[in-house]
């Protein structure tokens, strides 16, 4: 068949130059970012509006709760993305009304509806993981099959526990190693 | 309408600190969105952003100069201040302060303030 | 950072002239963007904001387009008020100034 280059493993989705994976089980907050460094990539951090309303747009279509890489957990009050950046003043328009609240401490930040959430990072909730696309140069072997750019996710509910993330990483393994034909 | 005024000294030598103030009206640092910078410019060259203060009273700092600089502000007043260590002659710039709305573009900015460093 | 790289540095023109800056990002930006007028002396200006939208009193003649990475500002017929620098501003990724550009009378 045609050898294509698809700059993302399998599930992934492609958007703006990064790949990004959406769970479909769930876990807590420090388990979503072990879960996104066992696959080479980071709890999404958004560095720009046209990602954040993609994003937003993915976890309101699957009606999720969605774990992303920021919290006030270093200090109280002080947001900080997982990359050790600061939440800007242009973002915190992004938080839902009366958001973050921190009841209870409510430390970790979600995709709550059409904006964000501050909740208690011991919750299991889904997540995102991103990491930079693949070149799909020759000399590194990313030509490969036709694949959809942006598969339909399964059900929500449908992942059993670390199924999607082990699936993922041997996807992604077998991407970066095999050409399909 | 909204005002900002800067203040300082006009002269400053090698290795002192330079502390400036904004003060401002027509608007309140603790209503949501609600900003105020300082940016420099250097005689005959670019705008160049030093610091931010959000109405949370989160600050910004300039990833090139932060070691050097302090921002806070003072609400109750309607003032804010930027101290910046170890001056330099490199350093010798009109600076501003600006509103910045809800931390993106800056819509008003005060008149400047000369500092000159110099032995 | 993100880096912000304006072109022409110097635009020579006349008046009734259509002029257009370029600015560009280092990295995608989305509108998030804006336009200064400055003159010797005085404090900027604000033209246009998140990329198209202008400014409360400014004049009509002045217009701003694009998105993501690349930027432009013009001016529809240059009016003998508009020499001056002009600078573009990001506010994605905390805030970056390009170099300006200075509009001389040709």
């Known amino acids: 068949t045609e050898r294509l280059c698809h700059p993302c493993p399998w599930e992934w989705t492609f958007f703006q130059g990064n790949c990004y994976f959406m769970s479909n089980s769930q876990r807590n907050w420090h388990d979503s970012i072990t879960a996104c460094k066992e696959v080479g990539a980071q709890l999404v951090v958004i560095k720009s509006a046209e990602e954040q309303n993609f994003l937003q747009l993915q976890s309101s279509r699957s009606n999720r709760f969605t774990w992303m890489g920021l919290s006030d957990l270093n200090q109280e009050g002080t947001w900080q993305w997982v990359d050790g950046s600061p939440l800007l003043p242009s973002f915190k328009q992004y938080w839902n009304r009366g958001e973050p609240n921190n009841v209870g401490e409510e430390d970790c930040a979600e995709f709550s509806g059409n904006g964000w959430n501050d909740d208690k990072c011991n919750l299991a909730k889904f997540w995102i993981c991103k990491k930079s696309a693949a070149s799909c140069s020759r000399d590194e072997e990313q030509f490969l099959s036709p694949a959809p750019a942006t598969p339909n996710p399964p059900p929500a509910g449908s992942g059993g526990g670390l199924n999607d993330i082990f699936e993922a990483q041997k996807i992604e393994w077998h991407e970066h190693h095999h050409h399909h034909h | 309408q909204v005002t900002l005024r800067e203040s300082g000294p006009a002269l400053v030598k090698p290795t002192q600190t330079l502390t400036l103030t904004c003060t401002f009206s027509?608007?309140?640092?603790?209503?949501?969105?609600?900003?105020v910078s300082w940016i420099r410019q250097p005689p005959g060259k670019a705008l160049e952003w030093l610091a931010l203060?959000?109405?949370?009273?989160?600050?910004y700092y300039s990833t090139s100069l932060k070691t050097r600089l302090t921002i806070s502000k003072d609400t109750s007043k309607n003032q804010l201040v930027l101290t910046m260590t170890n001056m330099d002659p490199v350093d010798t710039a009109t600076y501003y302060c600006?509103?910045?709305?809800?931390?993106?573009?800056?819509?008003?900015w005060g008149q400047g303030t000369l500092v000159t460093v110099s032995s | 950072d993100i880096q912000m790289t304006q072109s022409p540095s110097t635009l020579s023109a006349s008046v009734g002239d259509r002029v257009t800056i370029t600015c560009r990002a280092s990295q995608r930006i989305s509108n998030w963007l804006a336009w200064y007028q400055q003159k010797p002396g005085k404090a900027p200006k604000l033209l246009i904001y998140?990329?198209?939208s202008l400014e409360s009193g400014v004049p009509s003649r002045f217009s701003g387009s694009g998105s993501g990475t690349e930027f432009t500002l013009t001016i529809s017929s240059l009016q003998p008020d508009d020499f001056a620098t002009y600078y573009c501003?990001?506010?994605?990724?905390?805030?970056?100034f390009g170099q300006g550009t200075k509009v001389e009378i040709k």
């Open positions: 600006a509103r910045a709305h809800s931390g993106s573009y800056f819509d008003f």
């Open positions: 203060i959000d109405w949370d009273d989160d600050k």
């Open positions: 027509g608007f309140s640092l603790s209503t949501g969105g609600m900003c």
């Open positions: 998140k990329a198209s």
């Open positions: 501003q990001q506010f994605n990724s905390y805030w970056t």
